[in-house]
């Protein structure tokens, strides 16, 4: 769940709110679990910097020690820096906490790039701009790391919000959200609004930026427009979903839908990019290249290695196609689609040499571990992780970056047959083989 293409990711200033609010459909209101309506105290509780992750402020221990914690729906450990490190301004000091309990167990977590290890314990944890509760949670105190912490990222730990099945060292280590729900009356649901910057940030802006909202225990209607569409969580490990069709500017990629989910498709706030399986990536790039052929870009751009720049304010958004992913719906043979704009999949980065230009990286990349719907997707939408009903909801985000011609969209229903066949069944292997596949 980390680094390179997997976490960290990007954040920044909230994009301009939509001037026009679509009328809210009310047919699903009664289905929503948890508190409804306004969660004022949790709105804008996420911050971050471009490409470096969205973090929430948390406190651990007694007396409380404040830390910024990266929000990661692609892992399941709550882990915090607990020893001095050149990139950390502060870290969890267990010896100063009267409520810390040592579990006398170690944990090691490798990512595609980067890794960390630490000691397991429990302590009291709260989220100042979250629900007014304190819970005893498992904490991995990170004592050693390599390419995990990021210089200047401003976060000191990671909050894994996925399920126990992928927790390290094994599934007996209860994840934070499970502890929260068990120990309080908070409904088993959270939602994320990640607000991409939409333009390169200079240092001052980046530090001051608000990055979005993590609503714990429900849904805040001010954070989205239109209606929420839900897709089933296929299996409770990662937040695994099933993609049934992919279109580039309305043109079907026409691949066997199993390819889209090979070997899984997950929703992961700890990944920057939209990552696609090799075959799907190649087909998608070919189609995006064809659609944007009025301008030529170097191969390095499509590989995510090179920037492309335009004079400030002249980015030709219109030459780039929209990308639509069709997700399995809650009703048999019914799907819905989520559509992102180039404003989501072209990631703004500051090019020091040409700071008067607007520069971007192509934020769709190749994966060997399935489709990863990272920040590139999530920044277009308000995403509801309805664990209680084993489903994930998508609605157009009130803060997504768009232009006067196109907007991100969530639309349905569409008739799609045999969607169950789109899921890939991973061959049963021993646990160690399974876990090393995490990226």
């Amino acid at each position: 769940t980390h680094l390179g293409i997997r976490l960290p990711l990007r954040s920044g200033l909230a994009g301009p709110p939509l001037g026009l609010r679509l009328p809210r459909e009310t047919d699903e209101e009664s289905e929503e679990p948890g508190r409804r309506g306004s969660f004022v105290e949790m709105v804008d509780n996420l911050r971050g910097k471009s490409g470096q992750g969205y973090y929430v402020e948390m406190t651990v221990g007694s007396p409380p020690q404040t830390l910024n914690i990266l929000v990661d729906t692609g892992s399941s450990n709550f882990a915090v820096g607990a020893a001095p490190h050149p990139f950390l301004h502060r870290y969890y000091q267990r010896q100063l906490s009267s409520t810390y309990r040592d579990l006398r167990k170690g944990v090691y977590v490798p990512y595609t790039q980067g890794k960390w290890e630490g000691e397991l314990g429990t302590d009291l944890v709260s989220i100042p701009h979250g629900p007014n509760v304190t819970v005893r949670a498992n904490i991995a105190a990170i004592t050693e790391s390599d390419k995990f912490f990021i210089n200047g990222s401003n976060w000191e730990g990671i909050l894994g919000l996925a399920y126990a099945e992928i927790a390290r060292p094994d599934d007996s280590l209860e994840p934070f959200f499970d502890s929260l729900v068990k120990q309080t009356h908070i409904p088993n649901i959270f939602s994320l609004q990640l607000c991409g910057a939409g333009f390169p940030l200079n240092q001052t802006e980046a530090l001051a930026s608000v990055g979005g909202s993590m609503i714990i225990g429900g849904i805040d209607h001010s954070l989205y427009t239109g209606r929420l569409w839900y897709t089933p969580i296929r299996r409770e490990w990662y937040y695994e979903v099933i993609i049934v069709r992919v279109e580039i500017n309305g043109q079907d990629l026409k691949m066997d839908c199993k390819e889209y989910n090979y070997d899984k498709s997950i929703v992961d706030s700890g990944t920057t990019n939209l990552r696609l399986p090799k075959k799907v990536f190649e087909a998608a790039v070919k189609s995006i290249k064809a659609a944007s052929s009025t301008e030529k870009f170097p191969d390095g751009f499509w590989l995510g290695e090179q920037l492309v720049c335009w004079q400030a304010g002249t980015t030709p958004w219109n030459i780039f196609p929209v990308i639509s992913l069709y997700l399995m719906g809650e009703v048999t043979n019914q799907s819905f689609r989520i559509t992102i704009l180039p404003q989501q999949y072209l990631r703004p980065v500051e090019d020091v040499a040409t700071s008067q230009d607007d520069c971007y990286k192509f934020a769709v990349s190749q994966s060997s571990t399935g489709t990863v719907m990272g920040a590139v997707i999530m920044e277009g939408f308000y995403v509801v992780f309805d664990r209680a009903r084993k489903r994930i909801g998508f609605a157009v985000s009130a803060c997504h970056v768009h232009d006067e011609f196109r907007t991100a969209a969530v639309e349905g229903p569409f008739v799609t047959a045999d969607m169950e066949d789109c899921g890939y069944n991973i061959p049963q292997t021993d646990e160690s083989t399974l876990m090393t596949g995490r990226a």
Epitope: R104, Y108, E117, E119, T143, E144, S432
Partner: antibody, heavy 124, light 107 residues
Amino acid sequence: EVQLLESGGGLVQPGGSLRLSCAASGFTFSSYAMSWVRQAPGKGLEWVSAISGSGGSTYYADSVKGRFTISRDNSKNTLYLQMNSLRAEDTAVYYCAKGGSQWLYAPGSWFDPWGQGTLVTVSS
Amino acid sequence: EIVLTQSPATLSLSPGERATLSCRASQSVSSYLAWYQQKPGQAPRLLIYDASNRATGIPARFSGSGSGTDFTLTISSLEPEDFAVYYCVQRSNFPWTFGGGTKVEIK
């Protein structure tokens, strides 16, 4: 070839102190966790202490916690065990062992090879 | 602390016979268990790590199995050089602990 050579053992009175050293060669010392394990005469093995590659993480058996200190000098490729308040039950051959990586918990990161050991005798 | 109980304490066998050594943990150690061999006057050497993986240079006649609380080291056909003391060790929890050892002696 990996070589680990322990030194610093000997006879010491109860309550006394000793500092064991383990000189390492044949590998990039700073990239590997290290450990001390002891074996009382005619008895089994007992893990004593471990330290991560950077030296940032240290761990001890309950029987030595607060009395022994593990440390390393990566510039000198040397591992140390400072032993204070020694007791008769600390009498043993002390082995240093190289970890499988800089990590203490990584799969496969077990301790091998071991040095030949140095004998510590605590007696009045 | 996790207690590792090895059985039998002594195993008397002839060369060519199959040796089965047991190690039982007082609580689950997942697969964080290894086996070491120690000959008189020598330092221990790693045979099996992570319950079932043979260490570099260890002959195929040595195999490990098990996970959780019950583990087995099997020597399919004893060679003269295999007569030694065998220890299991866990590093799932602190403190890391060794079993009491099984001595494999010539019958």
